[in-house]
Each structure stands twice: as structure tokens, then as C-alpha cells.
């Protein structure tokens, strides 16, 4: 027999199959050109001394063989004696060490057996009613296919599935979608309606994330407020990375989980924009305001669960950087200005009502005045900070008020509203004899003392009614008692107390008369 022809004789070995686990398998035969054909197969086991024979039986019952030696691939033409227009049965017999091993048979019509390609190029992945839908362009001239998929997770081996028959320019497949683990998919195709035809190779891996992106497990810390009125938000713990199946390790597109940082500035609600989203790696600087920070995880199917943290306001207050002057027309605040064309947000809230919404005012962009100060004024009619109570005032600044990450804290302080001079007057002034020439003066704390940093000092005034001589005694704001010494017995005195702020002199309390009794000696 000629080597290019199928030999219609008995093969040169005994044809008993040894039935061992090794041997030829995965035989596939197909047309490779108008008149050319190819069969190839795998051989499992030691290859030394193995001779392969491709066997073919025609529908008439006549059989022939090709001897391929150690090769596991054979090309032949339509002139090789094998009928290409009619159904034939093919298998491989491998002879080694006096035993023969046989592959499973394939029955097919060679002319119609075109080598099918797997899905090529871009395989689109989407979610459809809780399932995974894959879609791709049908390879050229290969409309009409049967499609299979196989899939695995990081902890499971391949499972086979069927996509069903396809008969269009685009093909698709519905596959199971895992809730919490990533999957690797591969697809293969063969000619529709020819069971004996061979499958294409498996496609490149299609990497699919879980339906739910993982909950981002991260921790934040926030630094101290710097001199520029900003503090750094830092990520203490990076989000854990998703475990991936073998074929999806490396730069596999499709399974990426992206994390975004969503900032919501809770303070200063009257500003132009309260939220901003950033890529997670770009950890921002924040003002001393209160914020909610969310980390949002998302994958190709959309956003997943997010984790939200509350970053409390920085409670550090400035020692009186704010000057407030109350006039007949209204009230004006002054503070050290920032750069040219800065927008300020002035926020205030009665102390003890932190849960309620703060009052907020946004200034137009302003330049520093000649003294380097910025100002904000309001009329008495507006009623702003008009009640006689303690207010917490915070001033924020930004040259880019719409950029949430560019706000900074200018100052945070307290102010006593309304007529602080009168409201702060100490009450319940009492005088007690202390010794032969001294008394102890006590009073109830001023309302101003409820407002941190507002009360600068108390002043106690003592007047000798005989000589009209007056002495004044400054008292620390934390004290509500003073001893007046060097008093003369039998002289009438009046005592008054006032409470002063840094910018305002208080009103004197009602005069309290007293005298030290003259001691009569026995």
C-alpha cells in the first residue's frame, strides 16, 4: 500500500484491544481545505515504541488503515480511498509491546466535518434574571453550532454545561451565576447536527466576578487637624482581594472589584456640593467638619454592599481667633482671612442641641480687608444668634467651594448670643465675714461660664461709702469667690460683680451693702 492511501488489507498486528487505561483518545477528523482532510488524536501513556494506525470503515463494510508511525496527526486527500461524501467510522489503534489499544470511534461525513473555531474575540458578559448571559459573534462561515461551556471556581474542578443549538450571526449561552465566588468559563463549538464531528478547542478563559462584590473590609484613621485647618484621612487596612480561579489569575479582565470612596460632608449644609466620589487610592484631606465616608465596591454587574463610617467633627477650639462686635445696626464677625477670593461657610448651633440642624451661611468669595481680616455681618432683625445662650461657631473656607476635598477649618469657637453683657451678669452675690478686716464674696456662676472660652474673667468692685474709694479685683473665670482684705470696721461698703468676655465688658450686679462690726473689747 502507498503511504498516501488508506490500505485495504489487514493491519500488521493482532487486533485485540487490551482495554488498558492508557492509549489513544480524543480523535477528531475534519476538512481543512477543498480536498484536504486531517485527523488528530491524543495518546495517553509512554510513547516509546508506539505505532499508530488510523482505522476507517466505509458504509459498505470494507475497512482500511493508515500507518502513521509515532505521529498523532495525519493529513490525506479525497483521493486516499476514504469516502468523504458518505458516512464513515474512524478510530485509532495503537500498537506497542505486543498489545493493541483502541480509541473510541467517531462516525461522520468527512466533507461536512469542518473544524469549528471556539468563540473568538470579545465575549460579552451580562446578568439576566439571576443568570449569566454570554454573547459573541459567530466565527466566519460557521453559522449553525452546538456549544458547550465548562466552568470552575477557585475551589472546584471543571463542570460541563450545554448552551444548546445556535443558528445565527451571534451566539449566546445562559450559565449559572455564583453569588459570592468568582468563576472561570470556557466555551467550545462544533457543527450542528453532526454528533460525530469534533469539538473545537476551548476558548480563552472568560472570568466572571460573583454576583455580589465582596463587602469592603477596610478601616480608616484620621489625623489631627493641621495648621492649615485640614486633616488627612488614611486607609489603615486595604480591601481584601477576591480569590480567583486558576485561569483568571494575573491581569484577567472582568473579575476586577473596584473600590470607590464616597465623602459626605455633614457640616455646612448650605454649601454648593455635599458629596464627592473618589478612587479609593486617592485618600483626601478633610476639614475639621463631620463626615460620613462610604467605601463602595463594584464589579462588572454593578455596585455591591457598601460600608459607611462616621468621622466626627474635630472638637478642638481656638483661643478667641474670632472677634464679634455688636452695634446698633447689627453684628459683625471678624477673623484672620485666608487667601484672595475665598468663600467662607459660617455655621452655628446652640450648645446642647448638637443633634439639630446647624444654621449656615455662605459668603460670596471675598478678599482680606486691609487689616488682613475676613468679615460676616448680619442685622438684628435676622435674629441670628439673638437668643441669650451659648453657640458653637465654626468657620470653614475654600477657594473652590464645589470641591469637597478643598474645604478647611478656619476656626471653631464659642459665642454667647443676645445681650451677653446683661445675660452674663452674676447673680446671688453674697458677703460673709471672714476675719476682723476681711470678707468673703461669693456669687453664682455667670451664664457666660457655660460657653467654653467666652468668659475671660470676673471683676469684683468694692466701694468705701465714706471715702468713695473704689478697688477692683480680677478673678479667674473658674472661680466664683474672692476674699476682700484690709477693710475697716464700722465702715459701710458696697460690692458688685461683673463678668467680662474678650470683647465685651459685662454689666455690674446689683450693689450689695455690708460692713464689718466694730469689735468691742472686754
Amino acid at each position: 500500500c502507498r503511504t498516501s492511501e488508506c490500505c485495504f488489507q489487514d493491519p500488521p498486528y493482532s487486533d485485540a484491544d487490551s482495554g488498558s487505561a492508557s492509549g489513544p483518545r480524543d480523535l477528531s477528523c475534519y476538512r481543512i481545505s477543498s480536498a484536504g482532510y486531517e485527523c488528530s488524536w491524543q495518546y495517553e501513556g509512554p510513547t516509546a515504541g508506539v505505532s499508530h494506525f488510523l482505522r476507517c470503515c466505509l458504509s459498505s463494510g470494507r475497512c482500511c488503515y493508515f500507518a502513521t508511525g509515532s505521529a498523532t496527526r495525519l493529513q490525506f486527500s479525497d483521493q486516499a480511498g476514504v469516502s468523504v461524501l458518505h458516512t464513515v467510522t474512524l478510530w485509532v489503534e495503537s500498537w506497542a509491546r505486543n498489545r493493541t489499544e483502541k480509541s473510541p470511534e467517531v462516525t461522520l461525513q468527512l466533507y461536512k466535518s469542518v473544524k469549528y473555531k471556539p468563540p473568538l474575540g470579545d465575549i460579552k458578559v451580562s446578568k439576566l434574571a439571576g443568570q449569566l448571559r454570554m454573547e459573541w459573534e459567530t466565527p466566519d462561515n460557521q453559522v449553525g453550532a452546538e456549544v458547550q461551556f465548562r466552568h470552575r471556581t477557585p475551589s472546584s474542578s471543571w463542570k460541563l454545561g450545554d448552551c444548546g443549538p445556535q443558528d445565527d450571526d451571534t451566539e449566546s449561552c445562559l450559565c449559572p451565576l455564583e453569588m459570592n465566588v468568582a468563576q472561570e468559563f470556557q466555551l467550545r463549538r462544533r457543527r450542528l447536527g453532526s454528533q460525530g464531528s469534533s469539538w473545537s478547542k476551548w476558548s480563552s478563559p472568560v472570568c466572571v466576578p460573583p454576583e455580589n462584590p465582596p463587602q469592603p473590609q477596610v478601616r480608616f484613621s484620621v489625623e489631627q487637624l493641621g495648621r492649615d485647618g485640614r486633616r488627612r484621612l488614611t486607609l489603615k487596612e486595604q480591601p481584601t482581594q477576591l480569590e480567583l480561579p486558576e485561569g483568571c489569575q494575573g491581569p484577567a479582565p472582568g473579575v476586577e472589584v473596584t473600590y470607590q470612596l464616597q465623602l459626605h460632608m455633614l457640616s455646612c449644609p448650605c454649601k454648593a456640593k455635599a458629596t464627592r466620589t473618589l478612587p479609593l487610592e486617592k485618600m483626601p484631606y478633610l476639614s475639621g467638619a463631620a463626615y460620613n465616608v462610604a467605601v463602595i465596591s463594584s464589579n462588572r454587574f454593578g455596585p455591591g454592599p457598601n460600608q459607611t463610617w462616621h468621622i466626627p467633627a474635630d472638637t478642638h477650639t481656638e483661643p478667641v481667633a474670632l472677634n464679634i462686635s455688636v452695634g446698633t445696626n447689627g453684628t459683625t464677625m471678624y477673623w484672620p482671612a485666608r487667601a484672595q477670593s475665598t468663600t467662607y461657610c459660617i455655621e452655628w448651633q446652640p450648645v446642647g442641641q448638637e443633634g439639630s440642624l446647624a444654621t449656615c451661611n455662605l459668603t460670596a468669595p471675598q478678599d482680606p480687608d486691609p487689616a488682613g481680616m475676613a468679615t460676616y455681618s448680619w442685622s438684628r432683625e435676622s435674629g441670628a444668634m439673638g437668643q441669650e445662650k451659648c453657640y458653637h461657631i465654626t468657620i470653614f473656607a475654600s477657594a473652590h467651594p464645589k470641591k469637597l476635598t478643598l474645604w478647611s477649618t478656619v476656626l471653631s469657637t464659642y459665642h454667647f448670643g443676645g445681650n451677653a453683657s446683661a445675660a452674663g451678669t452674676p447673680h446671688h452675690v453674697s458677703v460673709k465675714n471672714h476675719s476682723l478686716d476681711s470678707v468673703s464674696v461669693d456669687w453664682a456662676p455667670s451664664l457666660l461660664s457655660t460657653c467654653p472660652g467666652v468668659l475671660k474673667e470676673y471683676v469684683v468692685r468694692c466701694r468705701d461709702e465714706d471715702s468713695n474709694q473704689v478697688s477692683e479685683h480680677p478673678v479667674q473665670p473658674t472661680e466664683t469667690q474672692v476674699t476682700l482684705s484690709d477693710l475697716r470696721a464700722g465702715v459701710a461698703y458696697t460690692v458688685q460683680v461683673r463678668a467680662d468676655t474678650a470683647w465685651l465688658r459685662g454689666a455690674w450686679s446689683q450693689p450689695q451693702r455690708f460692713s464689718i462690726k466694730v469689735q468691742v473689747s472686754d
Epitope: R232, P253, T258, L278, P279, K282, P284, Y285, S298, R300
Partner: antibody, heavy 119, light 107 residues
Framework: EVQLVESGGGLVKPGGSLRLSCAAS????????MNWVRQAPGKGLEWVGR??????????DYAAPVKGRFTVSRDDPKNTLYLQMNSLKTEDTAVYYC??????????WGQGILVTVSS | DIQMTQSPSSLSASVGDRVTITCQAS??????LNWYQQKPGKAPNLLIY???DLETGVPSRFSGSGSGTDFTFTISSLQPEDIATYYC?????????FGGGTKVEIK
């Protein structure tokens, strides 16, 4: 006023080296992530590389065409960004811009400096 | 790498016309997109950040919209000083990538 001023450009032969500098003022340079972006004559914009702030590790990243040949560095006390360019090729001819990192806080660009690689 | 496809590459419009430029990202970039204006011989100048926010000091005739993969930049009423090349840029992922640019001319 914010300013980024590039210097150190000029004509260099293929295979040669050049070091660009970018002097920054008007903002807290040490906090900023900085980039180099280039623009070949008559063409579009192309990112070259980035350096993070020291507080963020000071790590660098590069575009594929320049990786292994270009190095971005910074000197925070001097408020200066650098681009060391080695093994220059004719296709590296471009105007090189020093910029702050986009989408974070502010977006500043230098006026650009021309680098010509020609024999 | 994320590809940014900008169209058209050039356009000619009359003063007062509404001009629209589109930018398409090859993958989802959320709203991490800038629009720049570049005049001949000058550095690019940021007009829009976060896909739709107007940079401080930029005239309100410029606007941006979109999220995910499809973005639009609009000049509501073209002015003579708007003659320039406009670029989109994504900052979702490294490498930072720009669109090919749109050259805007006056008819």
C-alpha cells in the same frame, strides 16, 4: 498664586539622556501627587508617569513606552519634581508638562518644555 | 489600559451654536473623567472634573454629563474665544489616558 515651571529641555541625540525639573510654588507640594504628561508635535496628550506624595509611600508608576528608561523623583524641601530620561528615542520628542494628579484636589499644569530627540 | 474614544475629531460651528463632543471609555470609569481645553502653544486647562462639575472660574456655557462609559461635553453657545482643542481624560485607573482630542473651529 500657583505655579509649575519646567526646565531642562532641549536637543539631545538618540540614546542620550536629559533631566527635566519642575519648580512648584503656591500650594503644599509635599502633599501633592505629581505627574508628567507629554504631547508630541501636532499630536494628543500622553501620560508619562506619576509619583505619589511621601506620606503615601512616594511610589512611582510609568506608561509602558517609557518604563525602564524614565524615572520620576521629587525633592519636597526644594518643591521640585524631576524626570530623568535615559536611552532617548526619536519618538520621545514632545512638549513635556508637569501636572498635579487629576481628580483629587486641584489641577495645575506647567507651561511645558520642549524635548527634541534627533541625530 | 482604558481606551478613550473621542468624537468628532474636529468640528466647525458658528458663534452662538450649541456644540457637543462625546467621549467613550472602553470600560466603566464611574464619573472619574476630566474635560480640558487646550489653545495652541498653551498647556491644557481644566474645564470639567468628576464628569459634570464645573471648575472654579470656568464660564457656565461649558457643561459635562455622563457616567460609566459614555460622556458628553457641551458648549451651549459657542464664543470666538472657545476655538481650541478639547480633550477628555480618565483618572479611574493607571495609565491615565486621554481621548484623541476634538478641534473646534468657527465657521
Amino acid at each position: 498664586e500657583v505655579q509649575l515651571v519646567e526646565s531642562g529641555g532641549g536637543l539631545v541625540k538618540p540614546g542620550g539622556s536629559l533631566r527635566l525639573s519642575c519648580a512648584a510654588s503656591g500650594f503644599t507640594f509635599s502633599n501633592a501627587w505629581m505627574n508628567w504628561v507629554r504631547q508630541a508635535p501636532g499630536k494628543g496628550l500622553e501620560w508619562v508617569g506619576r509619583i505619589k506624595s511621601k506620606t503615601d509611600g512616594g511610589t512611582t508608576d510609568y506608561a509602558a513606552p517609557v518604563k525602564g528608561r524614565f524615572t520620576v523623583s521629587r525633592d519636597d524641601p526644594k518643591n521640585t519634581l524631576y524626570l530623568q530620561m535615559n536611552s532617548l528615542k526619536t519618538e520621545d520628542t514632545a512638549v513635556y508638562y508637569c501636572t498635579t494628579d487629576p481628580g483629587w484636589e486641584f489641577d495645575y499644569w506647567g507651561q511645558g518644555i520642549l524635548v527634541t530627540v534627533s541625530s | 489600559d482604558i481606551q478613550m474614544t473621542q468624537s468628532p475629531s474636529s468640528l466647525s460651528a458658528s458663534v452662538g451654536d450649541r456644540v457637543t463632543i462625546t467621549c467613550q471609555a472602553s470600560q466603566d470609569i464611574s464619573n472619574f473623567l476630566n474635560w480640558y481645553q487646550q489653545k495652541p502653544g498653551k498647556a491644557p486647562n481644566l474645564l470639567i472634573y468628576d464628569a459634570s462639575d464645573l471648575e472654579t472660574g470656568v464660564p457656565s456655557r461649558f457643561s459635562g454629563s455622563g457616567s460609566g462609559t459614555d460622556f458628553t461635553f457641551t458648549i451651549s453657545s459657542l464664543q470666538p474665544e472657545d476655538i481650541a482643542t478639547y480633550y477628555c481624560q480618565q483618572y479611574d485607573n493607571l495609565p491615565l489616558t486621554f481621548g484623541g482630542g476634538t478641534k473646534v473651529e468657527i465657521k
